[in-house]
C-alpha cells in the first residue's frame, strides 16, 4: 500500500542543523547562509506502529538515498545508525521496528522516540559538530527536541 511521505529538514532546539558526516553518520552543527544547503533532507513517512495516545509512527529516510535511520543494539546499547535498504521495497507501510520512531509533537517541537527501544530518543549534544545519537535521557544535557521545516522542491 502507498504511504504518505513528506520532505523536510530537522533542526534541534538550539537551531543546529543535521548534516552527513561520512557515509553512515549524521552530525549536528550551526549552519548559515549557503552552508544551509549541506543539511540533510529527510523523507518522513507515516508507517504502521503500536498504538499510543499522541505518538505518530514514522520512518526517517534520507531523500533520494536508500538510507534510513534505524535503532539497533551495539555492545548492548541502543544505537542510532544509518542503514542501507533496497530502494525497490522502501518506504513501505509496515516497516521493521528498528526503522520506526514515535513522533511526539508538542507546541511545534518534535521528539523522535525509538519504537524498538522505548524512552530512547534521537538526540544531539550541546557541543558543535558531534554525532546525532540515540539517547536514553530526556530533559538533561542532551537535546531531544527538534523543529521541522518543509522542503520546497
Amino acid at each position: 500500500a502507498p504511504v504518505r511521505s513528506l520532505n523536510c529538514t530537522l533542526r534541534d532546539s538550539q537551531q543546529k542543523s543535521l548534516v552527513m558526516s561520512g557515509p553512515y553518520e549524521l552530525k549536528a552543527l550551526h549552519l548559515q547562509g549557503q552552508d544551509m544547503e549541506q543539511q540533510v533532507v529527510f523523507s518522513m513517512s507515516f508507517v504502521q506502529g503500536e498504538e499510543s495516545n499522541d505518538k505518530i509512527p514514522v520512518a526517517l529516510g534520507l531523500k533520494e538515498k536508500n538510507l534510513y535511520l534505524s535503532c539497533v543494539l551495539k555492545d548492548d546499547k541502543p544505537t542510532l545508525q544509518l542503514e542501507s535498504v533496497d530502494p525497490k521495497n522502501y518506504p513501505k507501510k509496515k516497516m521493521e521496528k528498528r526503522f520506526v520512531f514515535n513522533k511526539i509533537e508538542i507546541n511545534n517541537k518534535l521528539e523522535f522516540e525509538s519504537a524498538q527501544f522505548p524512552n530512547w530518543y534521537i538526540s544531539t549534544s550541546q557541543a558543535e559538530n558531534m554525532p546525532v545519537f540515540l539517547g536514553g535521557t530526556k530533559g538533561g544535557q542532551d537535546i531531544t527536541d527538534f523543529t521541522m521545516q518543509f522542503v520546497s522542491s
Epitope: V3, S5, L6, N7, M148, S152
Partner: antibody
Framework: EVQLVESGGGNVQPGGSLRLSCTAS????????MAWVRQAPGKGLEWVGI???????FYASWAKGRFTISRDNSKNTLYLQMNSLRAEDTATYYC?????????????WGQGTTVTVSS | EIVMTQSPSTLSASVGDRVTITCQAS??????LSWYQQKPGKAPKLLIY???TLASGVPSRFSGSGSGTEFTLTISSLQPDDFATYYC??????????FGQGTKLTV
C-alpha cells in the same frame, strides 16, 4: 488570534475554473500541513486533499487531475485550483490545518467559501 | 479506499439523555479515528482524536471508544448545545481520508 480565512468562491459555469484562497493568521503556513475539505449543500463532509511540502500533496481519488493544492509561504496563503468544474462540485470549501503532522485530524478550520457550478 | 459508515443517520433525544453514535470502518484503522461536531452554517469542530482522546476544550461528557473497525461516540448527558451533526473520520497518515455520512442529533 490563530485563524484561517477562505476566499475566492462564487458562481462558475460547468467546465470552468476557479482558484480558492485560504489566508492564515497567527501562525506560519510554511510549518503546517494544510487540507481542503468540502461539503455539498445538505450533505456530509468530503476530504479533498492535503499539502505538506510542495512535492508532497495527496488527493482524494475523485480530485486527482482536476484539483491542485499549492501554497505561497510569503503570503501565508493556501490555494485550491479547481478545473473542469461540474455541477457536483457545488459546495462549501473549507481549509483546515492538520493537528499534528500525519495525525490526519483537523483541529483548526476556516469559515468556508461557497462555490456554485451552474449554467 | 476506506469507507466509513455511521449509524444512525438521525437521532432524536432529550436534554439529559445518554446518546451513542456508532461508526464502522470498511477495514481496520487501528485507533486512527476522529469525531467532529458541526452546527448549521458553521465549520466542523474536532471533538475526539485517536478514538478516545478529547480535543482541547471539549467537555468531559463526550467520550469515544473502539479500535479496528468499530467505534462509538458517547454523550453521557445531553446538553442543549449538543444538538448538531456528528461526523467520524478515519485519521492518521494514510493516503486516503474519509468521513462518515453524519448523524444528525435532534431534539
Amino acid at each position: 488570534e490563530v485563524q484561517l480565512v477562505e476566499s475566492g468562491g462564487g458562481n462558475v459555469q460547468p467546465g470552468g475554473s476557479l482558484r480558492l484562497s485560504c489566508t492564515a493568521s497567527g501562525f506560519s503556513l510554511s510549518d503546517a500541513a494544510m487540507a481542503w475539505v468540502r461539503q455539498a449543500p445538505g450533505k456530509g463532509l468530503e476530504w479533498v486533499g492535503i499539502i505538506y511540502d510542495s512535492a508532497s500533496t495527496f488527493y482524494a481519488s475523485w480530485a486527482k487531475g482536476r484539483f491542485t493544492i499549492s501554497r505561497d509561504n510569503s503570503k501565508n496563503t493556501l490555494y485550491l485550483q479547481m478545473n473542469s468544474l461540474r455541477a457536483e462540485d457545488t459546495a462549501t470549501y473549507y481549509c483546515a490545518r492538520e493537528r499534528n503532522i500525519f495525525s490526519g485530524d483537523m483541529a483548526l478550520w476556516g469559515q468556508g467559501t461557497t462555490v456554485t457550478v451552474s449554467s | 479506499e476506506i469507507v466509513m459508515t455511521q449509524s444512525p443517520s438521525t437521532l432524536s433525544a432529550s436534554v439529559g439523555d445518554r446518546v451513542t453514535i456508532t461508526c464502522q470502518a470498511s477495514q481496520s484503522i487501528s485507533s486512527w479515528l476522529s469525531w467532529y461536531q458541526q452546527k448549521p452554517g458553521k465549520a466542523p469542530k474536532l471533538l475526539i482524536y485517536k478514538a478516545s482522546t478529547l480535543a482541547s476544550g471539549v467537555p468531559s461528557r463526550f467520550s469515544g471508544s473502539g479500535s479496528g473497525t468499530e467505534f462509538t461516540l458517547t454523550i453521557s448527558s445531553l446538553q442543549p448545545d449538543d444538538f448538531a451533526t456528528y461526523y467520524c473520520q478515519n485519521a492518521g497518515g494514510g493516503v486516503s481520508i474519509a468521513f462518515g455520512q453524519g448523524t444528525k442529533l435532534t431534539v
